[in-house]
């Protein structure tokens, strides 16, 4: 090893200067007594190296790159050796930005997987390896006082979400939750959420069904549909309100919303629809009056309204 590069910092802010030194040992006897050290950034030769012989006989070249505008590049020092360039040493330089503050942190309590799933937006590209950690603690109050820390949740590479398993959660008790982003240039932290996992519970939607006609019940009127729904059993004891949406299967009509309906209604007659028309219907629910998140919309139910009852008018007026 005839040469060795040292740099002021291998990782810098994009656009910042960087200073490097290349030292050639004296005992590289095959070299010229006064070799000229050359610098190359990537494939481009870099002028401006200041070379000197040190007291111990080694040669040193120092270069300052005024702006490192590459997010990644190799800086090498070399000598002309015959007709070719002999590279003595090279270092990888990285440039980028410190992590921005992660924002839009939000969490959902999934009762099926028994986990609190939190997601966030990481902010602009840093061009550097940046790690995100979901940090949390239990708190008896409103998160001003920190209780037991909860094991850090580290997302898989490239993911901006993480799941805290049930064993680290305490329902009906507040948790402080935030995201920490870290890379070689710095650390940032999102604003802290303070939440009770049950207040961000996301329910599964009920299952929509057509109401079984009973012999004693009157059939639905024209333009009406009789619906029933089966609540999602694991969420049965959670007070909820629900809403329906419907639209004709054909045409470009947008969804029409009907609600709020109490989950307990369990059956509903939807009227004011077009007769003899196929409709698509869906239902969703939310924990209420306590806080919660809307469930997804249920799988679609497709039903057809009955024909309009025949009229006894013999004359049709065309306008």
């Amino acid at each position: 090893e005839c040469g060795h590069i040292s740099v002021s910092a291998p990782i810098v802010h994009l656009g910042d200067p960087i200073t490097a030194s290349c030292i050639i040992k004296q005992n590289c006897s095959h070299l010229d007594p006064e070799p000229q050290i050359l610098w190359r950034l990537g494939a481009e030769l870099q002028p401006g190296g200041r070379q000197q012989r040190l007291s111990d006989g080694t040669q040193e070249s120092i270069i300052t790159l005024p702006h490192l505008n590459h997010t990644q590049a190799f800086l090498s020092c070399a000598l002309n050796w015959g007709n070719s360039l002999q590279i003595l040493d090279q270092v990888e330089l990285r440039a980028g930005y410190p992590p921005a503050i992660p924002h839009n942190l939000s969490c959902l309590m999934n009762l099926t997987t028994s986990s609190l799933i939190c997601q966030w937006e990481p902010g602009p590209e840093t061009h550097l390896p940046t790690s995100f950690t979901l940090k949390s603690f239990k708190s008896r109050g409103n998160c001003q006082t920190q209780g037991d820390s909860i094991l850090d949740c580290v997302p898989k590479d490239g993911q901006s979400h993480c799941s805290i398993p049930r064993k680290h959660l305490l329902l009906y008790q507040n948790m402080g939750i935030w995201v920490q982003a870290e890379n070689a240039l710095g650390t940032s932290m999102s604003p802290q959420l303070c939440l009770d996992p049950m207040d961000v519970v996301a329910l599964e939607p009920p299952m929509l069904r057509t109401m079984d006609p009973s012999p004693e019940a009157a059939p639905p009127q024209a333009g009406c549909l009789q619906l029933s729904w089966e609540p999602w059993q694991p969420g049965l004891h959670i007070n909820q309100k629900c809403e329906l949406r419907h639209k004709p299967q054909r045409g470009e009509a947008s969804w029409a919303l009907v609600g709020p309906l109490p989950l307990e209604a369990l059956q509903y007659e939807l009227c004011g629809l077009l007769p003899a028309t196929a409709y698509t219907l869906q239902i969703r629910c939310i924990r209420w009056p306590l806080p919660g998140h809307w469930s997804d919309w249920s799988p679609s139910l497709e039903l057809r309204t009955t024909e309009r009852a025949p009229t006894h008018h013999h004359h049709h007026h065309h306008h």
Partner: antibody, heavy 118, light 107 residues
Framework: EVQLLESGGGLVQPGGSLRLSCAAS????????MGWVRQAPGKGLEWVSS????????PYADSVKGRFTISRDNSKNTLYLQMNSLRAEDTAVYYC???????????WGQGTLVTVSS | DIQMTQSPSSLSASVGDRVTITCRAS??????LNWYQQKPGKAPKLLIY???NLQNGVPSRFSGSGSGTDFTLTISSLQPEDFATYYC?????????FGGGTKVEIK
């Protein structure tokens, strides 16, 4: 403090009827599911029925379906269990309990003994 | 219906012992498993809800674990007041069902 107080138990002949009541205090009764759980002498716990906060949903155990009716009066903070066509095997201590959102029972009343015997 | 099987049905232990009671569901119930303690002539008392959440006022020597079909109630160091019968209960779907109980007796 949440309190549940059952009443209405007693001795009844097979085929007879009885109405149990549970007076609730210390919480907003109208916001919670309520339920009845029974325990035959020397036996384990058996869920009987539950009722949703406004009374619209009332699941029952198969063993009492069609014979027992659960109801509530939110204005009186009271839960009821109407028991008809009683059988010897209905003999038990009947507990009323408040249901948590994920289906646990807490707290429980002190229980009322129903004895069905001729 | 979901059947709940508790084991053992009874056990003898000494004060200070670590005691473990298991409960198995006949089908997956996620974390919808609750544990109760009942003393003779008294109403049951909730210890653990949603598999691992300690009810307010319950000593921290009680803990719950498990998910799916297999669950455990652990008493880390048995105290004289812990001699009682313990029940598990699933709340995943109706009918709500209880295990047969485990009686913890003094050795």
């Amino acid at each position: 403090e949440v309190q549940l107080l059952e009443s209405g138990g007693g001795l009844v002949q097979p085929g007879g009827s009885l109405r149990l009541s549970c007076a609730a205090s210390g919480f907003t009764f109208s916001l919670y599911w309520m339920g009845w759980v029974r325990q035959a002498p020397g036996k384990g716990l058996e869920w009987v029925s539950s009722i949703s906060s406004s009374g619209g949903v009332t699941p029952y155990a198969d063993s009492v379906k069609g014979r027992f009716t659960i109801s509530r009066d939110n204005s009186k903070n009271t839960l009821y269990l109407q028991m008809n066509s009683l059988r010897a095997e209905d003999t038990a201590v009947y507990y009323c309990a408040k249901l948590g959102e994920l289906g646990w029972f807490d707290p429980w009343g002190q229980g009322t003994l129903v004895t069905v015997s001729s | 219906d979901i059947q709940m099987t508790q084991s053992p049905s009874s056990l003898s232990a000494s004060v200070g012992d670590r005691v473990t009671i298991t409960c198995r569901a006949s089908q997956g119930i996620s974390s919808y498993l609750n544990w109760y303690q009942q003393k003779p002539g008294k109403a049951p008392k909730l210890l653990i809800y949603y598999a691992s959440n300690l009810q307010n006022g319950v000593p921290s020597r009680f803990s719950g674990s498990g998910s799916g079909t297999d669950f455990t109630l652990t008493i880390s160091s048995l105290q004289p007041e812990d001699f009682a019968t313990y029940y598990c209960q699933q709340s995943y779907s109706t009918p709500l069902t209880f295990g047969g109980g485990t009686k913890v007796e003094i050795k």
